[in-house]
């Protein structure tokens, strides 16, 4: 690696994948193993993330980019950059502090993650229940009895499941 020549900050010429080594007259040295620098002009390289335990490697660390992890089967990612893995549950369940628990009557979860949500209240829209809800599925609302004239068919599909927001950690 050639010694940098910038008149202002000699380190600014060090590319990604290197660091500016003050102990060696500010030459650009390659990042040591298990480290990376994703931008130029770095004074040290960053430690590569390790995907261990419940995490598995989605992308290996390189000299210019960090490793990326996802979760082993039976778990799903939470947080920015998959900072946590959370246990999957079955449809019709939600994860509590005591593990996976069935949705209470009147609630459902159609995914392996997230929380149980209340069935749609058809009567709020002036409709009736066409198909009863289960732990895994929302109710299906149909037309109100007054709308049941011959030829009328207006089945309203349930609203799409909404994922709870996850703040980065």
């Amino acid at each position: 690696f050639e010694r940098t020549r910038s008149l202002q900050d000699p380190c600014s010429n060090c590319p990604a994948g290197t660091f500016c080594d003050n102990n060696r007259n500010q030459i650009c040295s390659p990042c040591p193993p298990n480290s990376f620098s994703s931008a130029g002009g770095q004074r040290t390289c960053d430690i590569c993330r390790q995907c261990k335990g419940v995490f598995r490697t989605r992308k290996e660390c390189s000299s210019t980019s960090n490793a990326e992890c996802d979760c082993t089967p039976g778990f799903h990612c939470l947080g920015a950059g998959c900072s946590m893995c959370e246990q999957d549950c079955k449809q019709g369940q939600e994860l509590t502090k005591k593990g996976c628990k069935d949705c209470c009557f009147g609630t459902f979860n159609d995914q392996k993650r997230g929380i149980c949500r209340p069935w749609t209240n058809c009567s709020l829209d002036g409709k009736s229940v066409l198909v009863n809800g289960t732990k895994e599925r929302d109710v299906v609302c149909g037309p109100s009895p007054a709308d049941l004239s011959p030829g009328a068919s207006s089945v309203t599909p349930p609203a799409p499941a909404r994922e709870p927001g996850h703040s980065p950690q």
């Epitope: 660091f19 990042c31 298990n34 620098s37 004074r43 040290t44 960053d46 430690i47 950059g81 980065p168």
Partner: antibody
């Protein structure tokens, strides 16, 4: 040369919020991972958490309900807030950039929690 | 959390003596280990990274070794300026955790 400098009150009352600033020169906080650690009387160190180049944060689970690390890239500073402090939070607080082959440390600032 | 058990917690040694400090992790840390030296009133300085790689500018009398759960820092011939507190730190897994420190004093 990379320099980190902690600043903030040296005395905080119990139940109040401890607020510290780390001012960085010679490097940009828009790259890398910027950390807070503390050293208790008796020389035990604790890792507190980081804020990253992308503004994501990690907090030690032992502090998670009380800690916040934020930054201001225009000032090249990052901040520590620790809520509901007790006398157990009396320590020397250090900001650091862990790295390979170099780890950069601030000089540390002693914060005493006392009524 | 990974627990780092460092020993001894304090020791006296003579100038020129060979000194070894150890750190044991509660699980395999894949050599993701720093050794730091802290002198009174100063911030810590990195001596070793990745368990056995000497930081540029650190005297060659310092060396690190180990793998898996067991690591050590050796000073081959103690000098007066080596007194201080030595810490290991694992950076294999968050939250990073420190050893309890070894206070090294001159006999």
């Amino acid at each position: 040369e990379v320099q980190l400098q902690e600043s903030g009150p040296s005395l905080v009352k119990p139940s109040q919020t401890l607020s510290l600033t780390c001012s960085v020169t010679g490097d940009s906080i828009t790259s890398g991972y910027w950390n807070w650690n503390r050293k208790f009387p008796g020389n035990k160190f604790e890792y507190m958490g980081y804020i990253s180049y992308s503004d994501s944060a990690y907090y030690n689970p032992s502090l998670k309900s009380r800690i916040s690390i934020t930054r201001d890239t225009s000032k090249n500073q990052y901040y520590l807030q620790l809520n509901s402090v007790t006398t157990e939070d009396t320590a020397t607080y250090y900001c650091t950039r862990w790295g390979i082959p170099f780890a950069f440390w601030g000089q540390g600032t002693l914060v005493t929690v006392s009524a | 959390d990974i627990k780092m058990t460092q020993s001894p917690s304090s020791m006296y040694a003579s100038l020129g003596e060979r000194v070894t400090i150890t750190c044991k992790a509660s699980q395999d840390i894949d050599s993701y280990l720093y050794w730091f030296q802290q002198k009174p009133g100063k911030s810590p300085e990195t001596l070793i990274y990745h368990a056995n790689r000497l930081v540029d500018g650190v005297p060659s009398r310092f060396s690190g070794s180990g793998s898996g759960q067991d690591y050590s820092l050796t000073i081959s011939s103690l000098e007066y300026e080596d007194m201080g507190i030595y810490y290991c730190l694992q950076y294999d897994e968050f939250p990073y955790t420190f050893g309890g420190g070894t206070k090294l004093e001159i006999k």
